[in-house]
């Protein structure tokens, strides 16, 4: 029960996290104009990974895409790559984890296979979360560097009457969305890895023991209630020794229409 809950929760947390990573990647507010030095501006600038926008006081917003690949800073390209890798890994992880969920039965899939898939998706979520956190952090670092550089340059060239106020940019909403989403994906991945340990069959060796009764020759094997007792055909019966503790509803039977959720 705890394993199912952990796995399910890990999946949901990762799902929210990946949705957040996608949202952050698409958002335009990665960097927003710092209004501390110029709080009276009637034009508000903000930038994303894919385009830069200007919002005028009328509410009119104009966005222009970065229609160049080679002309963009290497750091921006790196951030884009990290976010895309994070999304791709996260999406694959989600796909894998859906089939790994304990509550979903697909054919006669073994628990060991589900455990492996859970671990795989968990690792994918962890890497996905780390990619997002790394991408956002690289961008944030770039902003901080540029912020202080522009602050140093801000008061230069003011010898005459004319002033040129340089636009400085600070952290946008997308950075916080990205950090939180990356963290959630990471947590979800860890939970999936923890759930995997509970799913994996334990290496418990129960030796087959033969009991020779005087009247009958019935061999009790790890397979459960079989041999000549008449229970062999009842595949729904609870198995006694099968490596790990299971409840009746977890016993795999031949696929039926109810097995595919």
């Amino acid at each position: 029960m705890a394993v199912t809950a952990c796995q399910g929760l890990g999946f949901v947390v990762s799902l929210i996290g990946i949705a957040g990573i996608i949202a952050a990647t698409c958002m335009d507010q990665w960097s927003t104009q710092d209004l501390y030095n110029n709080p009276v501006t009637a034009v508000f600038n903000y930038q994303g990974l894919w385009r830069s926008c200007v919002r005028e006081s009328s509410g009119f917003t104009e966005c222009r895409g970065y229609f160049t690949l080679l002309g963009l800073p290497a750091m921006l390209q790196a951030v884009r790559a990290l976010m895309i890798v994070g999304i791709v890994l996260g999406a694959i992880g989600l796909l894998v984890s859906i089939f790994a969920l304990k509550c979903i039965r697909i054919g006669s899939m073994e628990d060991s296979a589900k455990a492996n898939m859970t671990l795989t998706s968990g690792i994918m979520f962890i890497v996905s979360g780390l990619c997002a956190i790394a991408g956002v952090s690289v961008f944030a670092n770039m902003l901080v560097t540029n912020f202080w550089m522009s602050t140093a340059n801000m008061y230069t060239g003011m010898g005459g009457m004319v002033q040129t106020v340089q636009t400085r940019y600070t952290f946008g909403a997308a950075l916080f969305v990205g950090w939180v989403a990356g963290g959630l994906t990471l947590i979800g991945g860890v939970m999936m890895c923890i759930a995997c340990r509970g799913l994996a069959p334990e290496e418990t060796n129960y030796k087959a023991v033969s009991y020779h009764a005087s009247g009958h020759s019935v061999a009790y094997k790890p397979g459960g209630f079989k041999a000549s007792t008449g229970f062999g055909s009842n595949t729904k019966n609870k198995k006694i020794y099968d490596g790990g503790a299971r409840t009746e509803d977890e016993v795999q039977s031949y696929p039926s229409k109810h097995d595919y959720v």
Epitope: V40, S58, V162, Q166
Partner: antibody
């Protein structure tokens, strides 16, 4: 057709208050910010402030802060400019002007103006 | 506050001649985000409210004759009337649309010689 119709001329005594109205028609009232600008006789234009009829947000020129209040009545598509503690230098023609949506923050339509005379 | 300075204060030209009005701002009106200049030009005839002629330093408002042209960037702007007509007699104002408080130039009075 966009129209901004302002209230009639006012004569006030120093220290009194005046409330000028500007009724908008021909467009969606809440979609456009309304600015107020004044012009003293024979002088240039001076920006007073603006009101956003959508959310009642306002911004004032520091020069007038504390003395000017901009309000709006959505039901009648009217904006009001109230100026208190009037002095003789407040004698001017007061204009309401609509901020254009795609005009780079420029005012595309203006009211006919309201002359406010402050005299003892 | 951004100070807008117009020159000349008054201008007298003959009908059909070119008129040039200059406007200088104390701070750049060029927005780095979209490389647009936030400056407008207005025409005010006696007893009338101002009328928008040019916005964004160079974009003509709809209905404005094409003899009116705006140019310039950053801190220096120009309004040019290529062939002055009798109905162009008015006071012309430039306006900072970039930062609050919005400020206007002192005005340039155009007369016919």
């Amino acid at each position: 057709e966009v129209q901004l119709v302002q209230s009639g001329a006012e004569v006030k005594k120093p220290g009194a208050s005046v409330k000028v109205s500007c009724k908008a028609s021909g467009y969606t009232f809440t979609s456009y910010i309304m600015h107020w600008v004044r012009q003293a006789p024979g002088q240039g234009l001076e920006w007073i402030g603006y009101i956003n009829p959508y959310n009642d947000g306002t911004k004032y020129n520091e020069k007038f802060k504390g003395r000017v209040t901009l309000t709006r009545d959505k039901s009648t598509s009217t904006v009001y400019m109230e100026l208190s503690s009037l002095r003789s230098e407040d004698t001017a023609v007061y204009y309401c002007a609509r901020l254009g949506f795609t005009t780079r923050n420029a005012m595309d339509y203006w009211g006919q103006g309201t002359l406010v005379t402050v005299s003892s | 506050d951004i100070v807008m300075t117009q020159s000349p204060d008054s201008l007298a030209v003959s009908l059909g001649e070119r008129a040039t009005i200059n406007c200088k701002s104390s701070q750049s009106l060029l927005n780095s985000g979209n490389q647009k200049n936030y400056l407008a030009w207005y025409q005010q005839k006696p007893g009338q409210p101002p009328k928008l002629l040019i916005y964004g330093a160079s974009t003509r408002e709809s209905g404005v004759p094409d003899r009116f042209t705006g140019s310039g960037s950053g801190t220096d702007f120009t309004l040019t009337i290529s062939s002055v007509q009798a109905e162009d007699v008015a006071v012309y104002y430039c306006q900072n649309d970039h930062s609050y408080p919005f400020t206007f130039g002192q005005g340039t009075k155009l007369e016919i010689k």
